[in-house]
């Protein structure tokens, strides 16, 4: 039994850390492997992560861990058994993901307007809280050719959308993903995505 | 209450052993790093060894690295110090101090918040 | 190894004055924003040590609000904001961010 690719890992910066390897064959991850992790602290201990199948021959963890500190570094060992597979360490702060902003609402009531609001997904006393930037994807699933990429700089939440730029009768969707600029964080995951019909109509006298 | 008890000190000659006990009460015991520190007639506060809530992880210093063994009894609630090929400057005053809780990701660190009533260890010829 | 430096050694105090007690490390004991690993422990005479501050300013359980500790990476310091008879004993700072802990020379605290 061989890793193939060795674990590559990504953290939330809160709690979570998810570490990803192929394996050289089929491989039951959970049955057959544990990811083993310690913080390279006084009097820690370690910690076991029991991995799931991702695919084939790949396998997923999901590390439990304390808030993220830039200092943190842990150890991994990769074992199958008493065999150890890969010996490898991580610094979580050096590797941010953030976690998918949640809750995307559309208003639509909001007179010409379109305004799209959602979560930030941490809490206040996180240090990304205040240095997520986000993307907006809309899109049409009755005009193909229709997607548009909308770049939120600003730590508030929303994106408005003149109304008159979007076309009337037809639907469209929304997701949106995050980063953190002074973190150096990869693109989070999208959100779930939202669905809205545009039924704004230009005034009779525009036409 | 929390509460920790040594025991074992006494006289011994240069080169002999002793095995100090430290009962824990009044906290769960397997959780926290325990450590401990002596003290020379007359003089300051030294640490001396230290070891996780699980037992896997051990630390020494210089002066007794290869002497001293620190372990414990999570059934018993017990830490000990096997002291081996003992010498006149080991002669002290050992406290055991209830150190941090370990059994997190990080350990949560809440000072030395416990210490024993200390045994007194006398190394002569 | 981090060397722990007090200052100063003997401390004569008025009782209802203050008192401050310096401790400088060789090097940063700060793990991250708030978790400086320095602790202040008093030692009463033919007793055990007793802690008093943990993570340069976090009052232990029972400890009374006259003492106090600040401070962050190399420079801490205790402060007893009105000396009391009962305050008297050695004062120690130790670094516990890695082995091996390292203690203060002690500082001996009297009343004039």
């Known amino acids: 039994m061989k890793v193939l690719q060795e674990p590559a890992c990504v953290s939330d910066y809160m709690s979570i850390s998810t570490c990803e390897w192929k394996m050289g064959g089929p491989t039951n991850c959970s049955a057959e492997l544990r990811l083993l992790y310690q913080l390279v602290f006084q009097s820690s201990e370690t910690h076991t992560c029991v991995p799931e199948n991702n695919g084939g021959v790949g396998c997923v963890c999901h590390l439990l861990m304390d808030d993220v500190v830039s200092m943190d570094n842990y150890t991994l060992d990769l074992w199958a058994g008493q065999q150890l597979l890969w010996k490898g360490s991580f610094k979580p702060s050096e590797h941010v993901k953030p976690r998918a902003p949640g809750n995307l609402t559309v208003h639509t009531n909001v007179s010409d307007t379109v305004l799209l609001t959602w979560s930030n997904p941490y809490p206040p006393d996180n240090y990304l809280y205040n240095d997520l930037t986000y993307a907006v994807n809309i899109w049409s699933e009755n005009d193909p050719a229709y997607s548009r990429i909308h770049n939120v700089t600003y730590l508030k939440p929303t994106l408005r959308i003149p109304a008159s730029t979007l076309k009337s009768g037809i639907s469209y969707r929304a997701r949106v993903r995050a980063w953190a600029q002074h973190y150096n964080t990869t693109w989070s995951e999208w959100s779930p995505s939202t669905k809205w019909y545009n039924s704004y109509r230009e005034p009779f006298e525009q036409r | 209450e929390v509460q920790l008890v040594e025991s074992g000190g006494g006289l011994e000659q240069p080169g002999g052993s002793l095995r100090l006990s430290c009962a824990g009460s009044?906290?769960?015991?397997?959780?926290?790093?325990m450590t401990w520190v002596r003290q020379a007639p007359g003089k300051g506060l030294e640490w001396v060894s230290s070891?996780?809530?699980?037992?896997?992880?051990?630390y020494y210093a210089d002066s007794v690295k290869g002497r001293f063994t620190i372990s414990r009894d999570n059934s018993k609630n017990t830490l000990y110090l096997q002291m081996n090929s003992l010498r006149a400057e080991d002669t002290a005053v050992y406290y055991c101090a209830k150190d941090r809780l370990s059994k997190t990701i990080r350990p949560r660190y809440y000072g030395l918040d416990v210490w024993g009533q200390g045994t007194t260890v006398t190394v002569s010829s | 190894d981090i060397v722990m430096t007090q200052s100063p050694l003997s401390l004569p105090v008025t009782p209802g004055e203050p008192a401050s007690i310096s401790c400088r490390s060789s090097q940063s004991v700060l793990y991250s924003i708030g978790y400086n690993y320095v602790d202040w422990y008093l030692q009463k005479s033919g007793q055990s040590p007793q802690l008093l501050i943990y993570l340069g300013n976090k009052r232990a359980s029972g400890v009374p609000d006259r003492f106090s500790g600040s401070g962050s990476g190399t420079d801490f310091t205790l402060k007893i904001s009105r000396v009391e008879a009962e305050d008297v004993g050695f004062y120690y700072c130790m670094q516990s961010l890695q082995t091996p802990y390292t203690f203060g020379q002690g500082t001996k605290l009297e009343i004039k």
């Open positions: 070891i996780s809530g699980d037992g896997s992880n051990t």
């Open positions: 009044g906290f769960t015991f397997r959780d926290f790093a």
